[in-house]
């Protein structure tokens, strides 16, 4: 491991379309991979006027954009469905929004996704 | 270095049978889901079916369904696609992909092997 | 199912030319896009993933941009070994993954 670097090897997992994707709903998934690329964790969420919606959130391949993130961030403004990426095993459990460029406090605080 | 490479094809009459296979090398095999894509002449990719990394999962497009039967052998590190009641709209390259963790992309391909269906 | 619409379906450029080729998925797929590369008689070869990785080995002059619905793949400047076939794929609904039609690309 090169020091400073926090490696993932496993990050919570969760599909919000687990029946039709016949997966399982939620666990643990070990994040496999070349040895030439960094693994990393991520989580995709809608909000339905208010409400947090978890859509996915698994491992993710190497990504320059989340490379020394120890938090799940997401920073757009205002995107469709949020995405942020972190590294450190499991550091998506938990994941908040932060647009940039935004002068006002954030509307979101951290979320916290409670189990289904 | 990852190779795949297909083998299997060849020309089938419409309603008979074919069984392709993909050997894989230079990785885990049993980590990785799998995956057979296909393209007809002049056409262009469309995704045909997926197998987990443990085989416990299957997936087929619409147009197989019923026909068509993923499955592997990670002792062996081969996928195998086993093509029944085969038509002449089967006829194409398929290729094995090796998927990745998310986004999930399919980083590396096979050389593709040829099926034709025809009478 | 998730439809993506690439265009345009064909395009004749030149080397040194800068190409852009768009994706558009009928519904938001995230940064779940991944962009491939395909020459005649070969396999496809993968470029970009997560609407804007560049894979191990792929040029620099190669990038992804977009999110949601709206996507781009832009070649800086146009290489001879560049002339190909380039497919856009959503993964957002795996395993039941969905390609583009297609955008060749070819010498004017």
């Known amino acids: 491991a090169i020091l400073g670097r926090s490696e993932t090897q496993e990050c919570l997992f969760f599909n919000a379309n687990w029946e039709k994707d016949r997966t399982n709903q939620t666990g643990v998934e070990p994040c496999y991979g070349d040895k030439d690329k960094r693994r990393h964790c991520f989580a995709t969420w809608k909000n339905i006027s208010g409400s947090i919606e978890i859509v996915k959130q698994g491992c993710w391949l190497d990504d320059i954009n989340c490379y020394d993130r120890t938090d799940c961030v997401e920073k757009k403004d205002s995107p469709e469905v949020y995405f942020c990426c972190c590294e450190g095993n499991m550091c998506n459990e938990k994941f908040s929004y932060f647009p940039e460029m935004e002068v006002t406090q954030p509307t979101s605080n951290p979320v916290t996704p409670k189990p289904p | 270095e990852v190779q795949l490479l297909e083998s299997g094809g060849g020309l089938v009459q419409p309603g008979g049978s074919l069984r392709l296979s993909c050997a894989a090398s230079?990785?885990?095999?049993?980590?990785?889901?799998m995956t057979w894509v296909r393209q007809a002449p002049g056409k262009g990719l469309e995704w045909v079916s997926a197998?987990?990394?443990?085989?416990?999962?299957?997936y087929y497009a619409d147009s197989v369904k019923g026909r068509f039967t993923i499955s592997r052998d990670n002792s062996k590190n081969t996928l195998y696609l086993q093509m029944n009641s085969l038509r002449a709209e089967d006829t194409a390259v398929y290729y094995c992909?090796?998927?990745?963790?998310?986004?999930?992309?399919?980083?590396?391909w096979g050389q593709g092997t040829l099926v034709t269906v025809s009478s | 199912d998730i439809q993506m619409t690439q265009s345009p379906s064909s395009l004749s450029a030149s080397v040194g030319d800068r190409v852009t080729i768009t994706c558009r998925a009928s519904?938001?797929?995230?940064?779940?896009l991944n962009w491939y590369q395909q020459k005649p008689g070969k396999a496809p070869k993968l470029l970009i993933y997560?609407?804007?990785i560049l894979q191990t080995g792929v040029p620099s002059r190669f990038s992804g941009s977009g999110s949601g619905t709206d996507f781009t793949l832009t070649i800086s400047s146009l290489q001879p070994e560049d002339f190909a076939t380039y497919y856009c794929?959503?993964?957002?609904?795996?395993?039941?993954?969905?390609f583009g039609g297609g955008t060749k690309v070819e010498i004017k």
């Open positions: 992909a090796r998927e990745n963790v998310a986004p999930r992309p399919l980083d590396y």
């Open positions: 230079g990785f885990r095999f049993g980590n990785y889901a």
């Open positions: 197998i987990g990394a443990s085989g416990g999962s299957t």
């Open positions: 519904q938001s797929v995230s940064r779940f």
């Open positions: 997560g609407a804007s």
């Open positions: 794929q959503q993964s957002y609904t795996t395993p039941t993954w969905t």
